[in-house]
């Protein structure tokens, strides 16, 4: 069984979070994917999503978030550029599969953004003076308002959880809704 885990990323303001969410490509290649934040005691909030159906290697930008879905490789790339302290929180990738529940992809990301100069960038970081060029072909996608009949009974865990699942994705069976947020300009 696969354990539902989370990874803690500690980055500085101005740096870029650049992560991959892998999925079973045979099942989910063209499914719409989303990047969500889960604040303690709140429902997951969708910050950005791919188009529906998801287009291969076609960047979608919502504000400082860029999503790129590589169908052939079963990978969703998520970039959050010019990070701010207020971006700190727990994030996850999900796959929309209406009318079924969304699927959550491992692993969750606990992002901690701190103020201050980063010094030498780490292997996955850009410098604090990062001027990240957005690909010129990016598009904006509207995310669906997803409503589930179930409710959240407690806040998500702050550390690694031993929730076992048989596959690399997990059904979000305890989520009331995924709140659609407006696409910012």
């Amino acid at each position: 069984a696969t354990k539902l885990t989370e990874e803690k990323y500690e980055l500085k303001e101005g740096q870029t979070l650049d992560v991959k969410c892998d999925y079973t490509l045979e099942k989910f290649a063209s499914s719409q994917k989303a990047w969500q934040i889960i604040r303690d005691g709140e429902m997951p909030k969708t910050l950005a999503c791919t188009e529906r159906p998801s287009k291969n290697s076609h960047p979608v930008q919502v504000g400082r978030i860029i999503l790129e879905d590589y169908h052939d490789h079963g990978l969703l790339r998520v970039r959050m550029v010019n990070l701010q302290v207020e971006d700190s929180g727990l994030y996850q990738c999900v796959i929309y599969q209406p009318p079924k529940e969304p699927h959550m992809l491992f692993d969750r990301i606990r992002l901690v953004v701190t103020k201050g100069f980063s010094g030498t960038p780490g292997s996955n970081e850009n410098s604090t003076q990062n001027v990240y060029k957005i690909p010129p072909t990016t598009t904006k996608a509207l995310c669906p308002l997803y409503t589930s009949p179930r409710t959240v009974t407690q806040a998500p865990p702050k550390s690694t959880a031993d929730v076992s699942t048989p596959d690399s994705e997990i059904n979000l069976t305890n989520v009331t809704d995924i709140i659609r947020v407006p696409v910012f300009n």
């Epitope: 650049d18 290697s57 079963g74 996955n124």
Partner: antibody
């Protein structure tokens, strides 16, 4: 010692399949993605795809889709790459390589550990 | 796919010389570039990651720089043991692609 040990050289006929193994030791096999890269004699390097040994998820370069299958056996810390419908142009050294990442989920594609390579010769 | 054009394809230099290899991507790869060294009959070895970071244990005479589409790999003072073929590899876009390689020889 941290290493990837690959299976021995193979000679195959066109149309046949080959399965190359890559045994990891000295580190936690399920913590790092395994990638496969090939190199035809005297030629450059060509990425074939990746596999997450923990979950078994895979991704293949388009030109190999339908012919390549990457699998693993976590009980013996071994990854496999099977290539079918072999043709002469598949004659190459096939390498397995570990993708190192500070964070498991990070978009980092650095191959810091390589097997010694397996020569696959396709000849009638 | 992102094409990586590496030049020169081969070069010959004297011990102690400064050697420079360039790699040009067909599109912006956001510093997502690595450099490898491959000696005959051996597997590649990671030298530089994310355009400019020196891999642990690699001599400081090796360095990398660049941004956008243009990247440079430098050996500040060529040593006999540096005879090898050097490859760049981008990961700014999938599929991952490698440059054609630069064979470095000693004069």
């Amino acid at each position: 010692q941290v290493q990837l040990v690959q299976s021995g050289a193979e000679v195959k006929k066109p149309g046949a399949s080959v399965k190359v193994s890559c045994k990891a030791s000295g580190y936690t096999f399920t913590s790092y993605d395994i990638n496969w890269v090939r190199q035809a004699t005297g030629q450059g390097l060509e990425w074939m795809g990746w596999m997450n040994p923990n979950r078994g998820n895979t991704g293949y370069v388009k030109k190999f889709q339908g012919r390549v299958t990457m699998t693993r056996d976590t009980s013996i810390s071994t990854a496999y790459m099977e290539l079918s419908s072999l043709r002469s142009e598949d004659t190459a050294v096939y390498y397995c390589a570990r993708r190192r990442a500070v964070y498991r989920s990070s978009w980092e594609w650095y191959f810091d550990l390589w097997g010694r390579g397996t020569l696959v010769t396709v000849s009638s | 796919d992102t094409q990586m054009t590496q030049s020169p394809s081969s070069l010959s230099a004297s011990v102690g010389d400064r050697v420079t290899i360039t790699c040009q991507a067909s599109q912006d790869i956001f510093n997502d570039l690595n450099w490898y060294q491959q000696k005959p009959g051996k597997a590649p070895k990671l030298l530089i990651y994310h355009a400019s970071n020196l891999e642990t244990g690699v001599p400081s005479r090796f360095s990398g720089s660049g941004s956008g589409t243009d990247y440079t790999f430098t050996i500040s003072s060529l040593q006999p043991e540096d005879i090898a073929t050097y490859y760049c590899q981008q990961y700014g876009n999938l599929p991952l692609t490698f440059g054609g390689g630069t064979k470095v020889e000693i004069k």
